[in-house]
């Protein structure tokens, strides 16, 4: 799932369809924050794992998804926009296997932004696709408060101030 100006997109074999309500969670839009006008066509970059995925150069492939690791540093919101402008989104980690893959490919021990931030609207940690974090799988170390964003370091997730500048990971 990727996000455009308040519209969720469902990608089905490379084609896009607008969806204002899903039966499972009733999604209407995704997350709170700065949005750029990116066309639905551009945004429809996600592919399911069972499809053949060709990752762009400099992107790593894993389990049907493509990953890009930055070398420069930005705030969380600037990282968020950077990924969107490249038809991707900040990293959403689904399980510990994916976390292990990420960690293996991180070449430094510093914090790296992922697509998770705290929203005081629902008082929860929320992935950039609008889904809440599964507390049975992941534990976030640090404060859960407004302007808290998540960064990973050594396979752990930490709460950091969103204005801090770190490297980041994009995914599609």
């Amino acid at each position: 799932l990727l996000v455009s100006q308040g519209v969720l997109l469902k990608c089905q074999k490379g084609s896009c369809s607008n969806a204002t309500q899903y039966e499972d969670t009733g999604d209407l839009k995704v997350n709170n924050g700065t949005r750029r006008n990116i066309s639905n066509k551009d945004l429809c970059a996600s592919r399911s794992a069972d499809q053949t995925v060709l990752c762009q150069s400099e992107w790593l492939k894993y389990q049907g998804k493509c990953y890009w690791f930055s070398n420069e540093m930005k705030s969380w919101s600037d990282s968020y926009v950077y990924c969107l402008e490249r038809k991707s989104h900040l990293l959403i980690i689904h399980d510990q296997l994916e976390m292990a893959f990420i960690q293996k490919n991180l070449r430094q021990l510093n914090y790296v932004w992922i697509g998770l931030n705290f929203t005081s609207l629902k008082m929860t940690w929320t992935w950039v696709d609008g889904s809440p974090i599964d507390s049975k799988i992941f534990f976030i170390k640090g404060p859960a408060k407004e302007n808290s964003c998540a960064a990973i370091k050594e396979s752990k997730i930490f709460s950091e101030t969103c204005s801090s500048v770190f490297k980041w990971i994009c995914q599609y």
């Epitope: 039966e23 499972d24 009733g26 209407l28 005081s120 609207l121 629902k122 929860t124 889904s131």
Partner: antibody
Framework: SLEESGGRLVTPGTPLTLTCTAS????????MNWVRQSPGKGLEWIGA?????SAYYASWAKGRFTISRTSTTVDLKMTSLTTEDTATYFC????????????WGQGTLVTV | QIVVTQTPASVSAAVGGTVTISCQSS????????LSWYQQKPGQPPKLLIY???TLSSGVPSRFKGSGSGTQFTLTISDLECDDAAAYYC??????????FGGGTEVVVK
């Protein structure tokens, strides 16, 4: 879908628990609200419970109302009921990322 | 305590006409836009019309228009139809998990 149950005629001071049962989705990923409507009056937010199980209440409801949940039900426990609590009680699910309630139950009537 | 004031309490207009409902919050809404509008008919639960102040919910005709930001919001219903006769409520979402409804506006279509 959502369905409220437990509403009935009670005497003042009697405690009562209302249950909201969800089908087709898990409440563990939902932000669920309880809203009430007295006869001929407007909608009044009572409180909510988030995906992490934390509950939030309107200032007037704190202490007398308690919201809890399982994967398929959200309960509203009410104590020290008065005639002012006579109302239809609705549960509603918010969209994943806004405060808009895009799924409502039909409501259950509590008469005190 | 959050107070959401909705005006007018009741409004009447002819078929084909336009009605405007105002909603004012005592506190800034989350992101300045976390305002929804609902339509409710007797014996039914509310129905979501507009979210994020101005975004139409699925299946809602474009005759319904939401605007505003911060603490002041407006719902405009143009080209009124008989079926639009109902109660309309605004609702705000706030930091800290808080929510609040306006007092409601009864729309009568002549």
């Amino acid at each position: 879908s959502l369905e409220e149950s437990g509403g009935r005629l009670v005497t003042p001071g009697t405690p009562l628990t209302l249950t909201c049962t969800a089908s087709g989705f898990s409440l563990f990923s939902a932000y669920m609200n309880w809203v009430r409507q007295s006869p001929g009056k407007g909608l009044e937010w009572i409180g909510a419970i988030n995906s992490g199980g934390s509950a939030y209440y309107a200032s007037w409801a704190k202490g007398r109302f308690t919201i809890s949940r399982t994967s398929t039900t959200v309960d509203l426990k009410m104590t020290s009921l008065t005639t002012e609590d006579t109302a239809t009680y609705f549960c509603a699910r918010e969209a994943a990322d806004t405060s808009a309630n895009n799924l409502w139950g039909q409501g259950t009537l509590v008469t005190v | 305590q959050i107070v959401v004031t909705q005006t007018p309490a009741s409004v009447s207009a002819a078929v084909g006409g336009t009605v405007t409902i105002s909603c004012q919050s005592s506190q800034n809404l989350y992101g300045n836009k976390e305002l929804s509008w609902y339509q409710q008919k007797p014996g039914q639960p509310p129905k979501l019309l507009i979210y994020l102040a101005s975004t139409l919910s699925s299946g809602v005709p474009s005759r319904f228009k939401g605007s505003g930001s911060g603490t002041q919001f407006t719902l405009t219903i143009s080209d009124l139809e008989c079926d639009d006769a109902a109660a309309y409520y605004c609702a705000g979402g706030y930091s800290g998990g808080m929510r609040a409804f306006g007092g409601g506006t009864e729309v009568v279509v002549k």
